[in-house]
């Protein structure tokens, strides 16, 4: 961690992303410790705060205004040197959010990924942002940064993310900088979701009463494994949400969940995937795909589940 | 949205001990601190300290030296305000409010009232 | 420690005027002033900080300025849910102090 021998190192807790209003815990980490410190910041606004003043373990930032976005640096206490203090630490950048409005977030080709594929995410906004910042749920580091390229009063970046490995699965917030401001960043984009699919053994996927059925019979689609999945996903073919349920184990030590879509209309292609607590936007394979007929007078479409939308939560635990 | 709610009122006798509790939500407990103030029955505001929520090292004003000690439990979220010997002028409504180094306090609890009276 | 004085200790205006509290520190406190209200029965509700930074939700006929060692709220248009105690409080040094209070009150 250290920079060196007498350089202490600055890092931020949760993030170096922070919310206008929001709070953040600053450490100084210096010979193998937490120490007494000193804090600056490099422009030298918004420091009256800092005067004189010693700091024990970490310093609480907050509630954030634009004027703390900047690069901040400690010095360790070191009482018996000429000054008393070290080296200044590493930079550390603090982005303060919600100083624009927020730009837009898309996935190419899509947010259901398998592992090894790469991902286009598309920022884009018409505000015409300098920076764009591609940022992960739950990281400390900072975020990716890209020029913003304007075209036809747009101006957009897009954040090439790959080969996909379980790490890289979660959920993704873009913001937008203007110039001479790089570090006050808009309000976040929409969360997307990035999920990662084929890491587990498929489960297996069936319909009760049938795959064939009367219209206006009631369907239940069932998805189970002998892998002990916490949660299972159903999506259906063309369509933008995906349904998810919490899988109960069965007397026969398979893990199951009983998706009811209510009673058939129109039939469809489907599919699950299985998923654990600890990594919800890490799913199995797909299950083999499940085709629903529907025979007699379809009326209208089935209020049905499908393919993950960036909307839907599902890098959030099931509660 | 942040939410602190606070144990109930308290009715002590001089020389006993009371144990304000106060439980944050809405927000990450461990990146913020939690600040206490007195407001004694006739008087203003009066910053008693604070406890660094991440660290978990407390700072107490001059005269809330000795007999207040802050403490936090993280794994429930909750920061608590101990009075050991207590006095009649520690009669006072006590309030948590969350803040940091920085001393601004963002959202407060209700309030606990505690009687010292014989 | 910094002494803040408020005043006035109490004010009464009709609903529609424009109110000003002053709060002056005994020393610089280079605008690290919060104000916060605090209405009968319920806990003080932060409005400003930094001077000059209005808190969440907080109406924008609420507005504070100063430097220095002399700060001002001003409520553009007094209406009446603003009936409180009002105080200003220094977070540029330890121990964090706070003014008296004022109490406005509408006639």
């Known amino acids: 961690l250290m920079g060196g021998q007498d350089k202490p190192f600055l890092s931020a807790r949760p993030s170096t992303v922070v919310p206008r209003g929001g709070h953040v815990a600053l450490q100084c980490h210096y010979r193998r410790g937490f120490n007494n410190f000193m804090l600056y910041k490099e422009d030298r606004s918004h420091v009256p705060i800092f005067h004189g003043r010693i700091f024990q373990e970490s310093f609480i930032m907050g509630p954030v205004t634009p004027a703390h976005a900047g690069t901040y640096r400690c010095r360790g206490s070191r009482p018996h040197s000429l000054t008393g203090w070290s080296a200044p630490s590493n930079p550390l950048v603090i982005m303060v959010t919600g100083n624009h409005r927020k730009p837009s977030l898309l996935a190419h080709p899509g947010p259901l990924l398998k592992s090894g594929e790469t991902v286009i995410l598309q920022c884009w906004s018409d505000v015409m942002f300098e920076h764009f910042f591609l940022h992960r749920e739950g990281i400390s580091e900072d975020p990716s940064r890209l020029v913003g390229q304007i075209h036809d009063g747009v101006s957009k970046a897009n954040f090439s993310i790959g080969p996909l490995m379980p790490v890289l699965a979660g959920t993704y917030r873009c913001y937008g900088s203007v110039p001479h401001s790089p570090y006050q960043l808009s309000a976040p984009s929409d969360p997307l979701d990035i999920v990662i699919t084929g890491l587990y053994e498929k489960p297996s996927l069936s319909a009760q009463p049938g795959p064939t059925v009367q219209a206006g019979e009631n369907v239940t689609l069932s998805c189970s494994s002998w892998s002990s999945y916490d949660i299972y996903h159903l999506s259906r073919e063309g369509e933008a949400h995906e349904r998810r349920l919490r899988a109960v184990p069965k007397v026969n030590r398979t893990f199951q969940a009983d998706f009811p879509l209510g009673p058939a209309t129109h039939g469809g292609t489907y599919r699950c995937f299985g998923s654990f607590r600890a990594l919800p936007c890490v799913w199995s394979n797909s299950s083999d795909p499940l085709l629903v007929s529907v025979t007699g007078n379809p009326s209208s479409s089935w209020p049905s589940p499908t393919e993950p939308s960036s909307k839907s939560g599902i890098c959030r635990h099931l509660h | 949205q942040v939410q602190l709610v606070q144990s109930g009122s308290e009715l002590k006798k001089p020389g006993a001990s009371v144990k304000v509790s106060c439980k944050a939500s809405?927000?990450?407990?461990?990146?913020?601190?939690m600040q206490w103030v007195q407001k004694s029955p006739g008087q203003g505001l009066e910053w008693m300290g604070w406890i660094n929520s991440h660290s978990g090292v407390p700072k107490y004003a001059e005269d809330f030296k000795g007999r207040f000690v802050f403490s936090l439990d993280t794994s429930v979220s909750t920061a608590y305000l101990q009075i050991s010997s207590l006095k009649a002028e520690d009669t006072a409504v006590y309030f948590c409010?969350?803040?940091?180094?920085?001393?601004?306090?963002?959202?407060w609890g209700q309030g606990t009232t505690v009687t010292v009276s014989s | 420690d910094i002494q803040m004085t408020q005043s006035p200790s109490f004010l009464s205006a009709s609903v529609g005027d424009r109110v000003t509290i002053t709060c002056k520190a005994s020393?610089?406190?280079?605008?690290?002033v919060a104000w916060y209200q605090q209405k009968p029965g319920q806990p003080p509700k932060l409005l400003i900080y930094w001077t000059s930074t209005r808190h969440t939700g907080v109406p924008d006929r609420f507005s504070g300025s100063g430097s220095g060692t002399d700060y001002t709220l001003t409520i553009s248009s007094l209406q009446a849910e603003d009936v409180a105690v009002y105080y200003c409080?220094?977070?540029?040094?330890?121990?964090?102090?706070f003014g008296g209070g004022t109490k406005v009150e509408i006639k």
């Open positions: 020393q610089d406190v280079s605008t690290a």
């Open positions: 809405g927000y990450t407990f461990t990146t913020a601190g």
């Open positions: 409010a969350r803040g940091g180094d920085e001393g601004v306090m963002d959202y």
């Open positions: 409080q220094q977070h540029y040094s330890t121990p964090w102090t």
